[in-house]
Interface confidence: low
């Protein structure tokens, strides 16, 4: 998505099928207020952005309300009347789901079921990563609803958990973004803990899609 024209790099993120953020990095125009013009239909007139993002006092992006839009975004980034980057993109291919909400843990002996509120659209994977202080890497399990059961845990160990949502690649394509992680929560013997005291600094979680 970052293809350059006149040295302009762009990034598109479609937050939770609600808001589209288009940002640009144009070294040639670093001290210029570029304008962003867009339309959702190929045969409509362009509208100008009304909600710019600023970096060091200059425009660097645009936020658009686009709730569950069924569309291609046609856009043009301009220096005055001169287009410096023009493109069209299926917005949904740049989906970033929202972070899991209402995450709950239900313990039964050596297993835990992690649940959260499913998002209002489909073809998502809900991924739970977990580790104890004795694990060198995060373990991972995912399901296509937010109801993930992890078995074979050691009741005596303290485990850290967090959850995120990913778009299925065979539906949305390869250019989506995983959601932000939920907050880390720590559990031992079925009870929540402030932290897993003996936990060394956790390694970065695997960020593969």
């Amino acid at each position: 998505q970052g293809g350059a024209a006149e040295g302009v790099q762009i990034q598109i993120i479609y937050f939770n099928l609600e808001t589209v953020q288009v940002t640009w990095n144009a070294s040639k125009y670093s001290r210029t207020n570029l304008t962003f013009h867009y339309r959702f239909n190929g045969d409509e007139a362009y509208d100008q952005c009304t909600n710019y993002l600023l970096q060091e006092g200059h425009t660097s992006g645009c936020l658009l309300d686009a709730e569950q839009r069924d569309d291609i975004l046609y856009f043009s980034i301009r220096n005055g009347t001169h287009p410096v980057f023009t493109a069209s993109r299926w917005m949904v291919y740049y989906l970033k789901p929202s972070s899991p909400k209402h995450v709950r843990f239900s313990w039964h002996q050596d297993a835990v079921t992690v649940t959260c509120s499913d998002l209002s659209y489909g073809d998502l994977l809900y991924e739970v990563q977990y580790r104890s202080p004795f694990d060198t890497e995060w373990q991972s399990k995912q399901e296509n609803t937010c109801n993930v059961t992890i078995e074979g845990l050691d009741a005596e160990k303290c485990y850290s958990f967090w959850v995120r949502v990913k778009a299925m690649e065979d539906v949305y394509g390869p250019d989506t973004y995983p959601s932000d992680w939920s907050e880390v929560t720590c559990w031992q013997r079925g009870e929540i803990r402030d932290a897993c005291a003996e936990t060394p600094t956790p390694p970065k979680p695997k960020l593969s899609k």
């Epitope: 949904v92 209002s120 659209y121 489909g122 073809d123 539906v171 949305y172």
Partner: antibody, heavy 119, light 107 residues
Framework: QVQLQQSGPEVVRPGVSVKISCKGS????????IHWVRQSHAKSLEWIGI????????NCDQKFKDKATMTVDKSSSTAYLDLARLTSEDSAIYYC????????????WGQGTLVTVSA | DIVMTQSQKFMSTSVGDRVSVTCKAS??????IAWYQQKPGQSPEALIY???YRYSGVPDRFTGSGSGTDFTLTITNVQSEDLAEYFC?????????FGGGTKLEIK
């Protein structure tokens, strides 16, 4: 141009099953989702469910889960709706329609298949 | 399930008039609403998506508005070919649901 061509009318006895088809043309079949909707005098338009030809994923209204089975044949760009254990209440026009792969509105519709359940 | 209510089953209007078809959702659906027109003996046709955006080829006398729970399809300068039934539909959450329809009669 985009077309969804459905199979012809069916007259069936109560208790049997029927399979109706919807052939897509003029677009890349796996880039979209196919929906099934039925229309009867009693119930107006009812959404049955969605299937994504790219991976066969389906989502069906719970009230149709024992009645309707959606499948696709990617090689022929055709979606199928299998209706089981038909009763007179299933007599209706069944439409296929197309949306973006993740959802959105139903931009294109087939011509409909009339299913009549009669003893 | 989200219930879509079109309280008027029939509306009568004259050529050249303006008419508004309303639709109410039982819970907030944002702007995830479409409107369809179904002429007698034909399949439904999409008019409006995302509450207010016309499909290409749809005459600009058709206008959609609203968000949340209350939506309106307005037809200005009604033409005889607008004789049809109009349905709203939500696609905020599964199962997708339709309103019961409003039949527009031309006097």
């Amino acid at each position: 141009q985009v077309q969804l061509q459905q199979s012809g009318p069916e007259v069936v006895r109560p208790g049997v099953s029927v399979k109706i088809s919807c052939k897509g043309s003029g677009f890349t079949f796996t880039d979209y989702a196919i929906h099934w909707v039925r229309q009867s005098h009693a119930k107006s338009l009812e959404w049955i469910g969605i299937i994504r030809p790219s991976n066969g994923n389906t989502n069906c209204d719970q009230k149709f889960k024992d009645k309707a089975t959606m499948t696709v044949d990617k090689s022929s760009s055709t979606a199928y709706l299998d209706l089981a254990r038909l009763t007179s209440e299933d007599s209706a026009i069944y439409y296929c329609s197309r949306s973006r792969v993740w959802g959105g509105s139903l931009a294109y519709w087939g011509q409909g298949t009339l299913v009549t359940v009669s003893a | 399930d989200i219930v879509m209510t079109q309280s008027q089953k029939f509306m009568s209007t004259s050529v050249g008039d303006r008419v508004s078809v309303t639709c109410k959702a039982s819970q907030n659906v944002g702007t995830n609403i479409a409107w369809y027109q179904q002429k007698p003996g034909q399949s439904p046709e999409a008019l409006i998506y995302s509450a207010s955006y016309r499909y290409s080829g749809v005459p600009d006398r058709f206008t959609g508005s609203g968000s949340g729970t209350d939506f309106t399809l307005t037809i200005t300068n009604v033409q005889s070919e607008d004789l049809a039934e109009y349905f709203c539909q939500q696609y905020k959450s599964y199962p997708w649901t339709f309103g019961g329809g409003t039949k527009l009669e031309i006097k």
